[in-house]
Each structure stands twice: as C-alpha cells, then as structure tokens.
Interface confidence: low
Amino acid sequence: MVLEVSDHQVLNDAEVAALLENFSSSYDYGENESDSCCTSPPCPQDFSLNFDRAFLPALYSLLFLLGLLGNGAVAAVLLSRRTALSSTDTFLLHLAVADTLLVLTLPLWAVDAAVQWVFGSGLCKVAGALFNINFYAGALLLACISFDRYLNIVHATQLYRRGPPARVTLTCLAVWGLCLLFALPDFIFLSAHHDERLNATHCQYNFPQVGRTALRVLQLVAGFLLPLLVMAYCYAHILAVLLVSRGQRRLRAMRLVVVVVVAFALCWTPYHLVVLVDILMDLGALARNCGRESRVDVAKSVTSGLGYMHCCLNPLLYAFVGVKFRERMWMLLLRLGCPNQRGLQRQPSSSRRDSSWSETSEASYSGL
C-alpha cells in the first residue's frame, strides 16, 4: 500500500475541515483562474486504478504470508536463545517485529485495492500509522546495526558492551519514538473517504499539496537517504578495515549484514526514485501531464511492491547466507518436535564462543 493521495478519491473527512479553511487561497475558485496563473492540477488516473486492483491484492497476500512466516521464524530463533542477545541480534529482533507489523497491515491494503476500505476511519489511521512506523523503523534499525558494527570494528568501541540491554533498549526505544513522530501525519490526516463516482471508500490522506510534498520529502530523506548514507559510510569503512587486517573470518561474518543492506538498497531505491520524480512534479521542476502521472502511479505500485518484498527478504537472506540461523532454526524445529529430549535443548558447543557477534574479537555472527 503506497499511502499516496489517490487521484480518484474524494476528500470528505470532517476532521480536516479546519485545515481546509485555507483551501481557496491555494486553489483559487475565483473568476480569474487560467492555466497560466496556476500550477496544473494533478490528473485523475483511470488506468492506474485498474492496475492496482489487479496487481496489489495478489502481491500483498503473498507478501503477508511470506513475511509472517519468515519474520516469525527469525523472532522465534532469536527469542529461543539461552544466552543474552547481542546488540546486533537485538536490533534484528526489532527489525523482525517491524517487518511483521508492516506485513500485518497488508491484507487491509489488499482489500482496499481490490474492493474498497471497509474498516472505518479509526482502523485506517491505525493501519496507516502502523505501516509507516514500521517502514521507517526497518530503515532506521538497519542504520543502527551498521553504526554498531562501525563502532565495534572500525573504532574497536563496543557501545553496548557495558549494560548492553539498557543501551540497546534505549536505542530501539528512540527509533520507535522517532517513527511514532513520523507517523503523526497518519493519525491526523488519514481517514476513510468515499468516492461517489467509483462508489467506493478508500483509506486516503487528506491535506493540501504542500503537506503532501513535505511528507514525501520526509519519507525520502528519513526513511531512505539518511539510513542508506549511514549504512554506506559505515560499511565502506568496515570493509576497508577488514580488508587491511585480512580478517577472512570477520569478512565472512560481515557478509550477511552487507547482503541485508544491499537488499535494502535494491528493494527501496526504485520506489524512492519514483517518489523523487513525483516530488519534482509537485514542485514544478518536472512538467506534470496526465500521461506522465499515469506512468508514475503505476511505477509507484510496482516499486512499492518491490519495497515491501524487503520485509520478506530478510528472513530468506538469513536462511541462505547466515549459517548460524540455519543451525538454530533446525535446532528449534527439532526442539519443538521433540520437547522431551533434553539433549536437543542444549546449545551447540560453539554457541558460547559465538554468542555475541557485536562483542567478540572475531565479530562472528551469533543468532543468525
């Protein structure tokens, strides 16, 4: 679900009546309106609506199932550990929670795309906020992991060594708090709007053009560019240090996190490039026409689908790149299958040595 203002939706939510008092100043109904005086209005898109109706429900349903299973498995593996979680593992647990909460909203958006929003304005606000909270959380937690790795390897500083639970928890709380702040516009401006001509209600934003552009810029900067810059900077330095020290074991241990970051970049870059084009059209830097807007809307649906795929991708990456994850997943399955076999409840012999990826000199990767 790309929480954009759909070109087919009617704004009719009483909660924003006050906000719209300034409507006539930004969009003049006066006698002197002409194309030369005003920015061209956005075009309602006939084609993109049909595309969304066909494409999004199937994709969201698939991502919901994969995301729930995969992230559930990650959380189960991490929470089943006997030893305290390392800082990175803690961040990854929060990442799994964020991804799970995000995919939990997908069935709602699938129904919205296929038919209409049938869940009321309250759930529209909650689902929209939940969606964006976890979109931002995913990006910021990956940035936290990279910064933690950077301090640990490049500066040999274990930020979370002394009293790791408290420091990691505080960092995670700060991330969630920031995400809640970013989601405030969802609580305020999202609601179920009825479009008479489509005879359907949809969960949509309801605010002036300037707010729409500002929110997109925030999403682009805070949810993508900043985390990506932090990740790129941190991992570039980490790899430089590891290559110089010829630490093959550490390089191997770094592989998973680098792959996770690359996956983040690959999954979200196309979407944010499309959003950038949209921002440029909003600001008038790119000419707005109906053909271009239709292509942008369809591109947004496709690329956002690719972005949400990232929620399901992390568990797969752990499974295929993270040896420890496969080991622990197997152990967990065995333990669930044979609860009375005490031998299977013991940690593998190597677990203590590898128990905290962020705090061992080898920087080995523990939980996953």
């Epitope: 203002v5 070109d7 009825h194």
Partner: antibody, heavy 123, light 106 residues
C-alpha cells in the same frame, strides 16, 4: 478564465433524441472530471451524469441510466450528452459543470457551471 | 438514495436580518455543499466541505453541521444575498441536491 458553454438544446418529441455539447476553455480540460446537472422549470437541481478525465469511467443516476450517454472529446475540449428515449420529465435546463481537483482528488461537487441549455420534451 | 430536505422552502427576510437555512439528510453525510442561484443564472459554488467559503463569498456567510443536519447562516442579510440556495451531498450514490430555499425580500 474558466468558461463552459452549452449548446444543442431545443424542442424534441417524446421518444426522440438530442445531443448536447459543452465547449470548455480557460483550464486544462483533460485533467478534470465533468458532469451534466439539470434543472426542471421552477424546480431543484438534479445530477444527470459524470465522466472521468480520460473518459474511461461514466456514472449515471437510475433515472437516466440506459437512456443518456455522457462522453468527451479531449482533443476538442468538448463534453457531450447523448439523450435518447426522451420523456416529458426530462424537460429542463441542462448545465455542464466541472468537478474541482484538490490534492490529486476528484471532488463530487461542482466549482464551475455553464449558463445552461434548455431542452423541452413535448408533443 | 440520501434525501436532502431543506427548510424552509421560502424565507422572507429584511436586509440586516440574521438568517439560517437548514438541510437535513435522510442518513448521515460526511460533508455538505451549498450553492447560490439567482434567477436565470447558473448555480455558483458557495460553501464546500461544510464550512469553507468559496472564493469571493462574503464572510457574513457561514456553514456548519455534521451527520444528518447542516446549516447555512447569513449573519447580516444584504440585498445581493436574495437568491435560492441549494445543498448537495456526495457521500452516497447518487449525488443529490436539496429542494432549495428561496430567500426573498420582505
């Protein structure tokens, strides 16, 4: 300046047909949903038909569904209403009206109206 | 269909009077829209989103209400305000208008 100019009205017998036109100027016609609204002599307003900006979607109330067809020619900046099987109760002034757009959304009300064209259905 | 009932249908008032026109919906609507129409002229958008005045509408006009009952109020009637006012909804199919309120000089 936004201008909507209706034409094509006149006297027609019951069961007959008529085609109304609305020439639009002063705005990007291709970006707006358009509607026809009618007003019987001395009576109130009644929505007749709506068409989306690209002409893909059309909407009608039950009272005219199957008899009236709204269409548009974006190249000519013109809106049309083809009225078939006309009845006495279709006698009215027919207004062409524009739906505003705000924050990318069609609105279901009307910000600009033409001056109207009178259609009289009588034998 | 949602029926909109305007009251009164006719209203005689004097310049300077405070006037209130009511529009009742047969079932709840999200927003209401008001149009002003003068004889022989096309309607003009007057109030949208229940309470927002369209461009050029004097501040003596105000709109309020929610759910089933909405009002248009003129705080001090002026000669140019004498006209017919229509309410409209588009919460539910089809778009419907009220029967109109004709405001006449007493």
């Amino acid at each position: 300046e936004v201008q909507l100019l209706e034409s094509g009205g006149g006297l027609v017998q019951p069961g007959g047909s008529l085609r109304l036109s609305c020439a639009a100027s002063g705005f990007t016609f291709t970006s707006y949903a358009m509607s026809w609204v009618r007003q019987a002599p001395g009576k109130g307003l009644e929505w007749v038909a709506t068409i989306s900006h690209g002409g893909t979607y059309t909407y009608y109330p039950d009272s005219v569904k199957g008899r009236f067809t709204i269409s548009r020619d974006n190249a000519k900046n013109t809106l049309y209403l083809q009225m078939n099987s006309l009845r006495a109760e279709d006698t009215a002034v027919y207004y062409c009206a524009r739906h505003p757009i705000y924050s990318g959304n069609y609105q279901g009300y009307f910000d600009y109206w033409g001056q109207g064209t009178l259609v009289t259905v009588s034998s | 269909d949602i029926q909109l009932t305007q009251s009164p249908s006719f209203l005689s008032a004097s310049v300077g009077d405070r006037v209130t026109i009511t529009c009742r919906a047969s079932s709840g609507v999200n927003y209401l829209y008001w149009y002003q129409q003068k004889p022989g002229k096309a309607p003009k958008l007057w109030i949208y989103f229940t309470s927002t005045l369209a461009s050029g509408v004097p501040s003596r006009f105000s709109g309020s209400g929610s759910g089933n009952e909405y009002t248009l109020t003129i705080s001090s009637l002026q000669p140019e305000d004498f006209a017919t006012y229509y309410c409209q909804q588009f919460t539910s199919s089809p778009y419907t208008f009220g029967g109109g309120t004709k405001l006449e000089i007493k």
